[in-house]
């Protein structure tokens, strides 16, 4: 069927397919300093890491395009790691008034797939 | 702000950055001859093409992606190019009584963003 | 281990000040938001403000701006709650709460100060 | 009164499932996680469920959350008489930030 299961072990090896990691940046690092008061370091999970043919398959697009990445390499790119889905952030920052606190919904990954 | 405006027009040259490209497939690419009877070939709608700084950005997380992909490009991957939607697609295929109508709503992308 | 300790139970008289203290230990007390809850008698939690023991910075929910101070001192990891002229509506236990990691939830409470005030 | 809706009270036997639920806008629950605090007899609250459907370490299996739309739900299964407390959701709201739940009073009958 169309929506086959999503392959789910690594065929390259530990840690090398598409997963989610934590790097750690300052207000500096993102050029936020000017309006982002706190906190003054974020720890974004990021999605990273290889996809291979059929691994976390968002859907049926990509899957057609990890099938036709086989065929076509030079003409079809191979599915890539991106977020599936977001945790809410929320950041003190200035505002004319001096302070508010405001939530961000889609700033740090909470879990990725290849689409 | 966080939410700056994804910047529209590519800095690589014409055709070289993400975005919608029309692939050419017929069933027995995609393997699913024995069980899709019609349409026999389909024209898929496939994001490609790169993501250079700020073009095109999903979203806050794209941004910050793209900004510490260039402070520490090692560690942190370029946000790539991928569907921001879907067109349906109806096809018709083979079922135990017969044959039948069904539409797939993520099969062939519609736009694509940089995420 | 992370503990957020409360200073004792206090009994006020209408008009008086007083300063309320909250302190943090087992976790780094710069790199978490502190925020205040109070509870009247016999019914729920009410959230009244946050502060960024960091930068000192502070935002008061609309209900409490102006009635109370919310300041915090790095160098002994302590938060403090403090009113310059308390009311008899004022009493309530009032606890302190961590934040987590992205600012949404309060994954660590102090065991809550008790302040009674009356005539 | 609260921004968001819980009943006051809700009971069960030993072993039973209940749910308490939580009813907000799409100014909170709506669009960001749901929170859920457990505060026993005399005691500070504790957290219980986080971004929705998270439990932290040491809280057991049989609490478990979820949400959908504007409204959440806190289940607890096997329940045991420990369980008799004050149940809070918590969520932000743009207008007035964190915001609570008026609380729901679980009672374990028998």
């Known amino acids: 069927s169309a929506h086959a299961h999503p392959r789910d072990s690594c065929p390259l090896g530990p840690g090398r397919c598409c997963h989610l990691e934590t790097v750690q940046a300052t207000l500096e690092d993102l050029g936020w300093s000017d309006w982002v008061l706190s906190p003054r370091q974020l720890q974004l999970s990021m999605c990273v890491g290889e996809c291979p043919h059929l691994y976390r398959s968002a859907n049926t697009h990509a899957q057609i395009k990890a099938r036709l990445h086989g065929l076509q390499p030079d003409k079809v790119p191979a599915p890539c790691c991106v977020p599936s889905s977001y945790t809410p952030v929320v950041l003190m920052h200035r505002t004319d008034s001096g302070v508010s606190l405001q939530t961000y919904d889609d700033l740090v990954a909470r879990g990725c797939h290849c689409a | 702000s966080a939410h700056a405006h994804p910047r529209d027009s590519c800095p690589l040259g014409p055709g070289r950055c993400c975005h919608l490209e029309t692939v050419q497939a017929t069933l027995e690419d995609l393997g699913w001859s024995d069980w899709v009877l019609s349409p026999r070939q389909l024209q898929l709608s496939m994001c490609v093409g790169e993501c250079p700084h700020l073009y095109r950005s999903a979203n806050t997380h794209a941004q910050i992606k793209a900004r510490l992909h260039g402070l520490q490009p090692d560690k942190v991957p370029a946000p790539c190019c991928v569907p921001s939607s879907y067109t349906p697609v109806v096809l018709m295929h083979r079922t135990d009584s017969g044959v039948s109508l069904q539409t797939y709503d993520d099969l062939v992308a519609r736009g694509c963003h940089c995420a | 281990e992370v503990q957020l300790v409360q200073s004792g139970a206090e009994v006020k008289k209408p008009g008086e000040s007083l300063k309320i203290s909250c302190k943090g230990s087992g976790y780094s007390f710069t790199s978490y938001w502190i925020g205040w809850v109070r509870q009247m008698p016999g019914k729920g939690l009410e959230w009244m403000g946050v502060?960024?023991?960091?930068?000192?910075?502070?935002i008061y929910s609309p209900s409490f701006q102006g009635q109370v101070t919310i300041s915090a001192d790095k160098s002994i990891s302590t938060a403090y709650l403090q009113w310059s002229s308390l009311k008899a509506s004022d009493t309530a236990m009032y606890y302190c709460a961590r934040y987590g990691r992205y600012g949404t939830y309060f994954d660590y409470w102090g065991q809550g100060t008790l302040v009674t005030v009356s005539s | 009164q609260s921004v968001l809706t819980q009943p006051p009270s809700v009971s069960g036997a030993p072993g039973q499932r209940v749910t308490i639920s939580c009813s907000g806008s799409?100014?909170?629950?709506?669009?960001?996680?749901v929170n859920w605090y457990q505060q026993l007899p005399g005691t500070a609250p504790k957290l219980l469920i986080y971004?929705?459907?998270n439990r932290p370490s040491g809280v057991p299996d049989r609490f478990s959350g979820s949400k959908s739309g504007t409204s959440a739900s806190l289940a607890i299964t096997g329940l045991q008489a420990e369980d008799e407390a004050d149940y809070y959701c918590?969520?932000?709201?743009?207008?007035?930030?964190?915001?609570f739940g008026g609380g729901t009073k679980l009672t374990v009958l028998g």
């Open positions: 799409s100014s909170n629950i709506g669009v960001l996680y």
């Open positions: 971004s929705n459907d």
């Open positions: 918590q969520s932000w709201d743009s207008s007035s930030n964190y915001v």
């Open positions: 502060i960024d023991p960091d930068g000192s910075y502070t």
